[in-house]
């Protein structure tokens, strides 16, 4: 069974846990923080955004969307192209979706290959 590696599972986890600051218990808060940090690191290091792309943050209901104003955060700032100080190159252009100022590629295609190769040899 290869369901673990399907994008839908990643998507479900990301939408439910990323920046979810109002979980039912402390254990969930700890998990949510871990998921948020992992996604932030992944999007920054791999220059990618969401599971399938930036539209994930707009198409679906998510903790991130509940926590953030759409005009200010159409997607996390980690989706923006960054300068060497890890600041958005141009935050306004990133928020407006101007090509070259945000990452259009989803993270799943970048991590699924290595993960599947590792799991299935």
């Amino acid at each position: 069974q290869r369901d673990f590696f399907t994008p839908n599972l990643f998507l479900k986890q990301m939408l439910e846990r990323y920046q979810n600051n109002s979980p039912p218990n402390n254990d969930d808060q700890w998990k949510n923080n871990g998921v948020t940090k992992t996604w932030d690191r992944l999007m920054l290091q791999d220059n990618c955004c969401g599971v399938n792309g930036p539209s994930d943050w707009q198409k679906y209901t998510s903790a991130f969307r509940t926590e953030n104003n759409d005009a200010d955060y159409p997607w996390p700032r980690q989706c923006c192209v960054m300068n060497n100080l890890k600041e958005p190159l141009n935050l306004e252009a990133c928020k407006l979706g101007v090509p070259g100022f945000y990452h259009n590629q989803g993270c799943y295609e970048l991590i699924s290959g290595p993960m599947n190769r590792h799991a299935w040899g």
């Epitope: 300068n83 060497n84 100080l85 600041e87 958005p88 190159l89 141009n90 935050l91 306004e92 252009a93």
Partner: antibody, heavy 123, light 107 residues
Amino acid sequence: EVQLVESGGGLVQPKGSLKLSCAASGFSFNTYAMNWVRQAPGKGLEWVARIRSKSNNYATYYADSVKDRFTISRDDSESMLYLQMNNLKTEDTAMYYCVRQGDGYYVGWFAYWGQGTLVTVSA
Amino acid sequence: DIQMTQTTSSLSASLGDRVTISCRASQDISNYLNWYQQKPDGTVKLLIYYTSRLHSGVPSRFSGSGSGTDYSLTISNLEQEDIATYFCQQGNTLPFTFGSGTKLEIK
């Protein structure tokens, strides 16, 4: 030609205030991050403050030595950069330079410098 | 904060000499290293950014090299107008920090 002209320096007493200005010309001021860098007499250069462009929410950054005392601001319509200095200390005595930052992916370089304006804090 | 160290505070050389000024960072700064020239009248100019990129209008006798924590500025054929103090600066992280400077004098 890029030009940065500072003004507003002078003699001020400890705990006093002073506002420095910098008139910029020869480039699209509103698209660049701007900085203040200072140099105490006979000493090295010290970065003081930075302000990003409007498209980056005018984000500001300060050296620990001036945090909560100095405020950097800008007026894009007039191509002016400012440094409001409050609660001045004798160790703030320095030449203050207005500096235009580099652009692109690597932003941590100071491409153009003004001639400086001298601030002396003394009783 | 990242500390920048210029161990040589002053340097004497003859016109036409090849001069090298060094700079060390307290941690890896990923080549985000810049060099500035300050003339005796206080005028400051950028010479080199990102370790080795020559700023516009800077003579080609100036060059930069290095990686990790160790960097250097070289003037291949010293001229009278090069008499100045040279500062290195890291642009890797805030706060931006400078070396203490190396004053270049004529023998």
